[in-house]
Every structure is written in structure tokens, then in C-alpha cells.
Amino acid sequence: IYGGQKAKPGDFPWQVLILGGSTAAGALLYDNWVLTAAHAIYEQKHDASSLDIRLGALKRLSPHYTQAWAEAVFIHEGYTHDAGFDNDIALIKLNNKVVINSNITPICLPRKEAESFMRTDDIGTASGWGLTQRGLLARNLMYVDIPIVDHQKCTAAYEKPPYSGGSVTANMLCAGLESGGKDSCRGDSGGALVFLDNETQRWFVGGIVSWGSMNCGEAGQYGVYTKVINYIPWIKNIISNF
Amino acid sequence: TGWKIHYTSTAQPCPYPMAPPNGHLSPVQAKYILKDSFSIFCEPGYELLQGHLPLKSFAAVCQKDGSWDQPMPSCSIVDCGPPDDLPSGRVEYITGPEVTTYKAVIQYSCEETFYTMKVNDGKYVCEADGFWTSSKGERSPPVCEPVCGLSARTTGGR
């Protein structure tokens, strides 16, 4: 997380640390599912049990976490590895239900009405243990509040060199400051971009940390997130069938 | 031209059956003689027991020696047994401590703050069929679902 601050206990109780080939993140759904980015766990798709999933952690290097293990990995069938980031979404089924408490709580899925809390300039919050402006993985869970960026503006930002190959699709949303300095970064992948539903006073997942500029927090570039509301039927279908 | 002897006999009646408490007898007759039978039916919420063994039905037949072919059963109150545990929740006995018999009431509840009850209000009654049943007729216990989207950022620390 670039330009963020330290999270306090209970701030992001849905935050999941995923260790496999690299450091990634996810968000707890219900008490036995983790929502994450397809690119973050693609290498482990046939070896779910190799994923080391940690919940209730605030510090990346603390032994005080709740250990969970993957029973199965579900990568969106429309995701193609190393060919852009469209449909960059995945679900992990945990082998056991976790006990919910103030440090481990699931994130809500967006209601149909949630788009009214995710308009341009509405503030979302990204969190993770990814690279900070110091160029190192964060020891403490960090978070940053960032506004949603107009889709056309974001698409245009990634049409300029050297990003001319970067395709911002309708399945993505962008967030960040035009001036830069606040962003998610490598190691934050799979984590939730969350929004407060003002009617229910509950947080919901609007985006999944997916991709962005080569230099995190770069001015004129934005973080790109998987647009979760587009995938509610897919998520519900998998969770109800498995 | 010989003798003709006409025999007449009066059947030895069996002892008059007394229905067990919470049961009734059918058919009701003035007396029961050889080959007559009766059945015992228990009131709703009670079940037929012969000793400790449950019976689906009971019928006794009067034998030629004036005895019934089997002893009178009892009608014992239906016991639904201890209710299923509720993961992330608890069960409270409303009727009385550990009372699990017919018409007893229990109340399921979920752990406050972090879980909420799905399906029904959590109130179950021990019915005549021996099952704990909710007001909506469900026999399976409720489910405690995690509450989503809670954060110390909006609750000011928990």
C-alpha cells in the first residue's frame, strides 16, 4: 500500500494473508470462503493444499494468526493467465469454517443498490501487506483511502505508452489520485477494495486488487480493481454448489 | 334309538382391561371372551411402550383359558431427546432445565454481534412425533450465519 497508514486491530477483520509462491491477499466471505484475484493464486490452482492462508493477522511476521487451509480453488473460467487481467477473480474454499470474532469477520458482498456507493469520487479503502513507498513489503497491515476514478479517464491513462497494451475492461474499476501517491501495490493483489454501505453501515467489497502502473502511486495512473458487482452470480453459484 | 346330548357352554371372560394412563381402549365392550380383542391407543404426545421397548401398535386377544395373550402396555410421554447443538450459538431450555418431553419449548440463539440466525426465530417445540419443530414446521436446527462487514473503523473499536 502506497501512501497509507497502519491498520488497527479490528479495522479490516476480513483481511486474509495468502502465502504460496508469493505474498498475496484475499477477503473472507461467510466463514469458509476467501475471495481473491485469479492471478494471485493461478500457480496453485491444481495444488490448493499448498496455499498457506492466515486470518486475524495484523502483522505479516507475527505468529499470532489463525491458520486456514484451502480445500479447493475456483478460478473464473474467463480469466487467461498472462493475457491481461479480465475476469481476475477467484474463490478459495477453506477446509474448515473459521470462528468469527472481532479480528476475523467476513466482508459483505455488494447489494444490488451498492453501485450508488461506488460512483466516481466515492471513497474506497484498500488494505494489504504489499510494497510501500519504501520499496519493501509492509510488516504491519496498511490501508489507504482512495477515490473511484471515472472509467473513461482510467481507460485513457492506460492507452498511453508504455501501457498501450493494458486493457481496462468493463469488468474493472479504477481508484486513486490523479496526483498519485496513494495506491495499492505488488503484494496487495487479491485484497479487497471496500466501501461503506451508508444504509446498513456495513462494509462491502467493491473491488479486488488486480493490476496497475509499473510504479505504484504514479501520477496520472490508477490502481485497477476487479469489479465485484459484475460477478455476484458467479460467486453465488460457486458458493451454493460447493 | 340312542341318546342325544346337547352341550352348552359359557365362555370364560378375560379380566376387564383397564387402559393405561394417557391411553384409551378400543373397542369398548361389556365383556371380552374367547377371541375378542382390544387395541390401546395413546393420546397425542404419548407413545406405546412394552417395558422399555416402543411399539408401533398394540392389540391383545382373549385366550380360551380366560387370560390375555400379552400384558398391558404403557403410554409414555414422547421425549424428543437433547436438541442438536448449534454451531456458533447456544440452546436454552424454556420449559425447565433439561426438559425435552412433549410440548417442551427450547430457544436457540446465536452468539451476539458476530452471528445472526437464519431460517427462523429459533423457538422449537417438542412435537408428538418426537421431533423438535419450529413454528414454520422445520425439524432441522437453525443456522448461525456470520454477520458481514463489521469493522472497528465504523463501530469505533469493538
Epitope: D52, K59, L61, S62, P63, H64, Q67, W69, R139 | -
Partner: antibody, heavy 121, light 106 residues
Framework: QVQLVQSGAEVKKPGASVKVSCKAS????????MHWLRQAPGQGLEWIGD????????HYIEKFKDRATLTIDKSSSTAYMELSSLRSEDTAVYYC??????????????WGQGTLVTVSS | DIQLTQSPSSLSASVGDRVTITCSAS?????MYWYQQKPGKAPKLLIY???NLASGVPSRFSGSGSGTDNTLTISSLQPEDFATYYC?????????FGQGTKVEIK
């Protein structure tokens, strides 16, 4: 090389307190958690708790919550374990041990030599 | 708390013998750790994450297992291996140790 050197043996009276030190060298002290364990004579190992050397956050097992206090001094790369209201059953060898930071973070890759604490009237 | 039960509690063996120590957990654990302790000395890490050899530990030591049953094997016992061995888990809080297995010279 990586080393943890503990303070010497102590004899204490019941009701007293004892403070054991553990000086670390050969690694970045603040990168690791420091754990404290004990071993009563002829017995197995028992975990007391740990301290994060980067920010002094502590965790104790229930049994020691009220009597054990773990602290650190970053400037001297030293960890301390104080145990109060001593009783005879606290007689044991007390160990500091460094927490791993490579995999699960849940084991001890370097141990101090141990400090014998005897509680006797 | 997860209870760890080591068996045997003690064993007598000769140099060159293959020795197996088991550690049975009261509920499933993901990873097991093994330590060696000699009299008057601190424990020393042998095996981490069930089967990985700690730095500087001879290859005659190996760990295996899953779920509730884990094993430490010494393929060919050496004179310096006579010691007490402990298993440890932290799959569930709090971390716990086995009661130890003492390996003595026959």
C-alpha cells in the same frame, strides 16, 4: 554467529520476583519475536509467551497473564522476562528462544542457554 | 489445547540402529516441529514444518506425517544422538510440546 546469552542462576524466596535477561547478537533484533519457555526439573517444555521486538507487543498464555512481564531494550538488543509472586512450583530452567521468520513463524530456531531459577524458603 | 503424546517415552538403542519416535496429536495439526535436548543444555531445532531439516542438522534425521500422527526418524543412530527429543505444534493456540522421548544407549 546468532547467539542468545542469558543471565545467571537465581535463588528466590516464595512471593518474590525474578527478572531474567537475554542478550541477542548476530542478527537484527527487531526482526524477530522473542519467546520465553520454561522447563521444571525432569519435566517437559512449557511456553510462557512472546514479545515482538519491533514494537514490544506481548502475548502470554492464560496461566502466566497476571504474573509474567516481557520487555525489551532495543538499544542493547536485550529481552527480559520478569515473573512475580514466585512459588516453589516456579522452580525451573527459563529459556529465551528466537521465533522463526521464514515460514510459519511458529517455531524456535535459536535458544538461550537457560537460566535456573530456584524458589525456596 | 492440543495434547501431544510421544511414544515411546524412552528407548534403548545401539549405534547404527534405526530409531523411530512418534508424536500423536489430540486433533489434527498441519505442521510439526522437532527438537533435540541434551542434559544441561537448551533444546536445538531439528525439523521444521513437519519434514524440513533445520540448518546444520545431519541428514540422518527426517520428519514425516500428517494430521494427528507424526514421526521423527534417525536412520543410523550416532553416539551424539543420545538425548531427549520433543515434538511441538502451533496449529492451534497455544503452542504445546510432547512430553519427550529419551533415547539411551543399550
Amino acid at each position: 554467529q546468532v547467539q542468545l546469552v542469558q543471565s545467571g542462576a537465581e535463588v528466590k524466596k516464595p512471593g518474590a520476583s525474578v527478572k531474567v535477561s537475554c542478550k541477542a547478537s548476530g542478527y537484527t533484533f527487531t526482526n524477530h519475536h522473542m519467546h520465553w519457555l520454561r522447563q521444571a526439573p525432569g519435566q517437559g517444555l512449557e511456553w510462557i509467551g512472546d514479545i515482538d521486538a519491533s514494537d514490544s507487543e506481548t502475548h502470554y498464555i492464560e496461566k502466566f497473564k497476571d504474573r509474567a512481564t516481557l520487555t525489551i531494550d532495543k538499544s542493547s538488543s536485550t529481552a527480559y522476562m520478569e515473573l512475580s509472586s514466585l512459588r516453589s512450583e516456579d522452580t525451573a530452567v527459563y529459556y529465551c528462544a528466537r521465533g522463526d521468520i521464514t515460514t510459519t513463524l511458529r517455531y524456535f530456531d535459536v535458544w538461550g542457554q537457560g537460566t535456573l531459577v530456584t524458589v525456596s524458603s | 489445547d492440543i495434547q501431544l503424546t510421544q511414544s515411546p517415552s524412552s528407548l534403548s538403542a545401539s549405534v547404527g540402529d534405526r530409531v523411530t519416535i512418534t508424536c500423536s496429536a489430540s486433533s489434527s495439526v498441519r505442521y510439526m516441529y522437532w527438537y533435540q535436548q541434551k542434559p544441561g543444555k537448551a533444546p536445538k531445532l531439528l525439523i521444521y514444518d513437519t519434514s524440513n531439516l533445520a540448518s546444520g542438522v545431519p541428514s540422518r534425521f527426517s520428519g514425516s506425517g500428517s494430521g494427528t500422527d507424526n514421526t521423527l526418524t534417525i536412520s543410523s543412530l550416532q553416539p551424539e544422538d543420545f538425548a531427549t527429543y520433543y515434538c511441538q505444534q502451533w496449529s492451534s493456540y497455544p503452542l504445546t510440546f510432547g512430553q519427550g522421548t529419551k533415547v539411551e544407549i543399550k
